[in-house]
């Protein structure tokens, strides 16, 4: 019973975590304009992995996709890759874990096979969570570096009366969503791995029992039964469903008035 609960909870936690990783990856608020120097700005900038946006106080929001692939910073590409790998691994892990759930009966699947699949999905969740945490942390580190660099030369035109204030960026909501989601996926993976140990039948050694029949001596010795733990080469072919990613090029969250871009 405890094993089923641990497995089920691990699955649910991982599911929430992966949904969070997907949400974080799609979010536009990975970095948001630092409002320390101007808390009442009429123009607010924020950036995601796929596009950058500007929200005016008027309520109009304009988003522009990063149409170049080669022109983007290597770090941003690395973060994108880590998040996508995390999502793909998590999605496969979810697919595997559905079939591995003890409460779900699929044909005559043995506990050994379920244990094997539970461990596989658990490892996938752990790696998925680590990918998300790593991706978000790399981006956060990049932000911190850029923040202090832009602070060092905050005012680039102090020669005369005219000031050119550089826009500084700080942590956006997506970073926190990503960290929490990565952590949940990681915890879910660990729970799946723990559940796997309970699912695997223990190795049982039956002691030899001698049966003495009257008349003639016959010793019946049943062989020691060895349960397959399923950690060997009990692998099955799995289909990977990779949904095509769609990106919105431009977004106008305002009653349309002009085509201006």
């Amino acid at each position: 019973m405890a094993v089923t609960a641990c497995q089920g909870l691990g699955f649910v936690v991982s599911l929430i975590g992966i949904a969070g990783i997907i949400a974080a990856t799609c979010m536009d608020q990975w970095s948001t304009q630092d409002l320390y120097n101007n808390p009442v700005t009429a123009v607010f900038n924020y950036q995601g992995l796929w596009r950058s946006c500007v929200r005016e106080s008027s309520g109009f929001t304009e988003c522009r996709g990063y149409f170049t692939l080669l022109g983007l910073p290597a770090m941003l590409q690395a973060v994108r890759a880590l998040m996508i790998v995390g999502i793909v691994l998590g999605a496969i892990g979810l697919l595997v874990s559905i079939f591995a759930l003890k409460c779900i009966r699929i044909g005559s699947m043995e506990d050994s096979a379920k244990a094997n699949m539970t461990l596989t999905s658990g490892i996938m969740f752990i790696v998925s969570g680590l990918c998300a945490i790593a991706g978000v942390s790399v981006f956060a580190n990049m932000l911190v570096t850029n923040f202090w660099m832009s602070t060092a030369n905050m005012y680039t035109g102090m020669g005369g009366m005219v000031q050119t204030v550089q826009t500084r960026y700080t942590f956006g909501a997506a970073l926190f969503v990503g960290w929490v989601a990565g952590g949940l996926t990681l915890i879910g993976g660990v729970m799946m791995c723990i559940a796997c140990r309970g699912l695997a039948p223990e190795e049982t050694n039956y002691k030899a029992v001698s049966y003495h029949a009257s008349g003639h001596s016959v010793a019946y010795k049943p062989g020691g039964f060895k349960a397959s733990t399923g950690f060997g080469s009990n692998t099955k072919n799995k289909k990977i469903y990779d949904g095509g990613a769609r990106t919105e090029d431009e977004v106008q969250s305002y009653p349309s008035k002009h085509d201006y871009v």
């Epitope: 009429a42 900038n45 109009f60």
Partner: antibody, heavy 118, light 113 residues
Framework: DVQLVESGGGLVQPGGSRKLSCAAS????????MHWIRQTPEKGLEWVAY????????YYADTVKGRFTISRDNPKNTLFLQMTSLRSEDTAMYFC???????????WGQGTLVTVSA | DIVMTQSPSFLTVTAGEKVTMSCRSS????????????LTWYQQKPGQPPKLLIY???TRESGVPDRFTGSGSGTDFALTISSVQAEDLALYYC?????????FGAGTKLELK
Amino acid sequence: DVQLVESGGGLVQPGGSRKLSCAASGFTFSGFGMHWIRQTPEKGLEWVAYISSGSRPIYYADTVKGRFTISRDNPKNTLFLQMTSLRSEDTAMYFCARFYYGNSFDHWGQGTLVTVSA
Amino acid sequence: DIVMTQSPSFLTVTAGEKVTMSCRSSQSLLNSGNQRNYLTWYQQKPGQPPKLLIYWASTRESGVPDRFTGSGSGTDFALTISSVQAEDLALYYCQNAYSFPLTFGAGTKLELK
């Protein structure tokens, strides 16, 4: 057709109060940020206050902060400016304006004159 | 606060003439996020409220004649009327649309010679 009509102006004594109204029509009022802007021959155009579509955030010019209160009634399509502790320098033509692309004011009312004098 | 300085205060022109008025801000109005300049131009005729002409420094509002052109970036901006018409005689204001408080220039008055 977008229309903004201000009302409530008039002669007020220094230290007195006045409430200006701006009736909006011809557009979805609840979807736009609104402003009060005043004009005097001496100072020209001076931004007074801003209220976003959902009534938060609200910003004021330093010259009126603590004395003026901007508010709106979305179901009634009306914008308000409650003015207290009025001074002679508050004498001006008060316009309400709609906020649009580029943080510009694309529609203005005809204005209502507020005169602060003893 | 961002200070907007308009020059000249008065411009005396003849009909059909090309005219340029300038506006300078004490701080850059260029937003790095979308590379747009948050400067607006208005026209005000006597007894009327201001009318929006140009936003984002160079985008003409719908219905505004194409003889009106906004230009400039950062801190220096200009409004050009390619061929002044009698109905263009008015006060022209520039406005900082980048940060609160939203500030206006003192205006440039266009007069007939």
